[in-house]
Interface confidence: low
């Protein structure tokens, strides 16, 4: 009997594993994991760590197999890999496993931090960078300023952080940020604690976002007929009601300046 503790390693090149609509989703979303082999295969297996047998398998005489995870729950999150095999390889022989795909099923992403680089005190004529740092790569980051309804800036970042540059003359103020998945179905983070940028000689202070006075809710995001921004009022009763900035078109994320970009 063949009882490997992991899919047997072999010299067959690894497949690629991806997720639709995203690797970060809210509970209840239908997720499709796509395993693509570099050559036509007979069987594709979807593995989780520690599993001897595949979680799911598909017999597909082609390069692509799809695994459907219906109405996912947080328990279905975690690390996945896929392997493929050909019938002429003999029993129990699988390809090298794909790179890991981490599926995160959550109502809300972890709170980011917001820090000033080089620091929260701005000298005359000096610019300051605000770094909004989350825990996940390939997210869209949004910066808000107290008293300004619309998002101040947004960035899509391949790194788990994004840097926002503020011109020195207009830098002082109270800021917060959050991040969200770049496409629907949107998952949003909690809002960072606020960060106060001050002139030299004034003392900076930080205070919890939920108690920040004068922060206004942002206006509606740019309209996208193909997606609907989630309402967050149900779990953000205090402070900002944050909504993702939707792409200008269904097909692409447009990193051009947002519709409203005052005070920078």
């Amino acid at each position: 009997d063949i009882t490997p503790s992991v899919p047997p390693a072999s010299y067959h090149p690894k497949p690629w594993l991806g997720a639709q609509p995203a690797t970060v989703v809210t509970p209840g979303v239908n997720v499709t994991l796509r395993c693509r082999a570099p050559q036509p295969a007979w069987r594709f297996g979807l593995f989780k760590p520690g599993e001897i047998a595949p979680l799911l398998f598909r017999d597909v005489s082609s390069e692509l197999a799809e695994f459907f995870l219906e109405e996912v729950t947080p328990a279905q999150g975690g690390i996945y890999r896929c392997c493929y095999r050909r019938p002429d390889w003999g029993p129990g022989v699988w390809s090298q496993p794909s790179d890991v795909l981490e599926l995160l099923v959550t109502e809300e992403l972890p709170r980011p931090s917001l820090v000033a680089l080089p620091g929260p005190v701005v000298g005359p004529g000096a610019n300051v960078s605000l770094r909004c740092a989350g825990r996940l790569r390939n997210m869209s980051f949004v910066l808000y300023r107290e008293g300004v309804a619309a998002p101040l800036q947004y960035r899509h970042s391949a790194q788990p952080w994004a840097d926002f540059t503020l011109l020195g003359a207009r830098a002082p103020g109270t800021y917060s940020c959050y991040y969200h998945t770049p496409s629907a179905p949107y998952v949003l983070s909690q809002r960072s604690e606020v960060l106060v940028i001050s002139w030299e000689g004034e003392g900076p202070e930080a205070r919890p976002a939920s108690s920040a006075p004068g922060m206004q809710a942002p206006g509606p995001p740019p309209s996208d007929p193909g997606a609907q921004a989630p309402s967050l009022s149900s779990f953000r009763p205090r402070g900002l009601v944050l909504q993702p900035l939707l792409p200008q078109t269904q097909d692409s994320w447009d990193p051009a300046p947002p519709p409203s970009d005052p005070g920078v």
């Epitope: 009882t3 599993e51 047998a53 398998f57 017999d59 005489s61 019938p87 029993p91």
Partner: antibody, heavy 120, light 107 residues
């Protein structure tokens, strides 16, 4: 040694359902697929479907997709097949089998079979 | 679905003879084929897997050959316990189908 022990013969009425069990022993239940096969008198073998007892993942022969439901109980190392809306065509011996290969191929170990008779 | 055509449907032979049963797939299935023996009132038994590999405990008088679409099971020097029905089964894409069977009877 590997053993698959199936439930006893069933005499059932048309239109009702029946649940056949297959208790596994002698190996790690969640490490191997359990297959189900139908054998009608004087006819050949038909593959019904397969379940991964570890995950509950299933693959069915389309012909049986609305007829058979495969489940597994890890705590008792038992696989089940429920047959619904029974007709005389469902009268057959049903076998469970375990794959030789951990990913579900080559039916190396078989249960003794369960005779299901559908009769008014 | 892939169709498996087995021949002959029945065969009447004597102990000590050699027989060959063939199985043809409706499309290429590489070496992805198994052979089973089933005796009256008993469960099937795996004889050959991956077209040519003998399962544990199967006597060496049994042998499997072929790949692609044409396969055969050969039994040398038939023994009394070899009589019964034989089935091929493919494993290339669900549903995994069996051949119609070959009934091997004593002459």
């Amino acid at each position: 040694q590997v053993q698959l022990q199936q439930s006893g013969a069933e005499l059932v009425r048309p239109g009702t359902s029946v649940k056949v069990s297959c208790k596994a022993s002698g190996y790690a239940f969640t490490n191997y697929m359990i297959e189900w096969v139908k054998k009608r008198p004087g006819q050949g073998l038909e593959w019904i479907g397969v379940i991964n007892p570890g995950s509950g993942g299933t693959n069915y022969n389309e012909k049986f997709e609305n007829k058979a439901t495969l489940t597994a109980d890890k705590s008792s190392s038992t696989a089940y097949m429920q047959l619904s809306s029974l007709t005389s065509d469902d009268s057959a011996v049903y076998f469970c089998a375990r794959s030789l290969d951990f990913d579900g191929a080559w039916f190396a170990y078989w249960g003794q079979g369960t005779l299901v008779t559908v009769s008014a | 679905d892939i169709q498996m055509t087995q021949s002959p449907a029945s065969l009447s032979v004597s102990v000590g003879e050699t027989v060959t049963i063939t199985c043809r797939a409706s499309e290429k299935i590489y070496s992805n084929l198994a052979w089973y023996q089933q005796k009256q009132g008993k469960s099937p038994q795996l004889l050959v897997y991956a077209a040519t590999n003998l399962a544990d405990g199967v006597p060496s008088r049994f042998s499997g050959s072929g790949s692609g679409t044409q396969f055969s099971l050969k039994i040398n020097s038939l023994q009394p316990e070899d009589f019964g029905s034989y089935y091929c089964q493919h494993f290339w894409g669900i549903p995994w189908t069996f051949g119609g069977g070959t009934k091997l009877e004593i002459k």
